[in-house]
Amino acid sequence: APVRSLNCTLRDSQQKSLVMSGPYELKALHLQGQDMEQQVVFSMSFVQGEESNDKIPVALGLKEKNLYLSCVLKDDKPTLQLESVDPKNYPKKKMEKRFVFNKIEINNKLEFESAQFPNWYISTSQAENMPVFLGGTKGGQDITDFTMQFVSS
């Protein structure tokens, strides 16, 4: 079956938006007014993954770009990156595990846990203008909660 996708933007729980920082990195910062147009629009695809009541497997691509968030080991540490893919083959229902995140949603707050590295989450720093990264702690200084805003296709 073809994969189902929705366009959306994400903001962290401090209302920081996500923008491109160079070709293969995202950063989080507060945006207002016209600057909101800078925020990245994701194509969230609902993909196959392990069955769980509270975790929905998704892939997060950048809308109209052949880039997907993926989780890989770099220097033995789980790391978030933007990975370029062949647009003829993506998105697909059976995404490779490095592209899959378990969306955990409670009261409209979302967390994105790496399927490849359980208990590692898409995270932002408290500080402004810092890279979006994969963090191994929840409830600490770093932010792992996001809100989602729908965007028209």
């Epitope: 079956a1 929705l6 609902f46 929905i56 998704v58 229902k93 409209n108 729908f150 028209s152 296709s153």
Partner: antibody, heavy 120, light 107 residues
Framework: QVQLQQSGAELMKPGASVKISCKAT????????IEWIKQRPGHGLEWIGE????????NYNEKFKGKATISADSSSETAYMQLSSLSSEDSAVYYC?????????????WGQGTLVTVSA | DIKMTQSPSSMYASLGERVTITCKAS??????LSWFQQKPGKSPKTLIY???RLVDGVPSRFSGSASGQDYSLTISSLQYEDMGIYYC?????????FGGGTKLEIK
Amino acid sequence: QVQLQQSGAELMKPGASVKISCKATGYTFSRYWIEWIKQRPGHGLEWIGEILPGNGNINYNEKFKGKATISADSSSETAYMQLSSLSSEDSAVYYCSTIYYDYDQGFTYWGQGTLVTVSA
Amino acid sequence: DIKMTQSPSSMYASLGERVTITCKASQDIDRYLSWFQQKPGKSPKTLIYRVKRLVDGVPSRFSGSASGQDYSLTISSLQYEDMGIYYCLQYDEFPYTFGGGTKLEIK
């Protein structure tokens, strides 16, 4: 609690159009797809299409393209389905239902149905 | 379109009996399968989604399972209020498609 309140029964002439409504209460309207389903005696249940009020995305069953037009008004938290060029084949009960935006929970809630009768 | 072949189309069963209704999908539906119950003149009521997850408030005598593309709804001990028509639905691929229904009556 969640409720989907549909508009009342309609008696229509062949060739006319009808617009039926589905008023949602008790949940975040923008985050659930509204589904439209047709039920005719002897024909079972047929899926017509869906709309996600949060972004206006619409998916139709090809069979109903040109027959059904689905819309939603977020300010009144109401979804609509217009049926055009009515014929006796369109005489049916039409239901609205909901499914969460990530498709996980199935058709969770249902309206009470709207009976459309097409007769000369 | 994905065809959902539901069987039996009708059946009689005794109170307390174990009842199983099946739906066969014509292709993979990635466990996006629901079961509904409908009583005469009423709207359908969702019992189960994603093959085996029970909707809140649905009695535990209802259960769902899958084997390949064969999906089953089981009522472990039939109660009088369980009579009605049961439908399956695949919501993996557009257009979503329903089974033809199983009319369950008390013997």
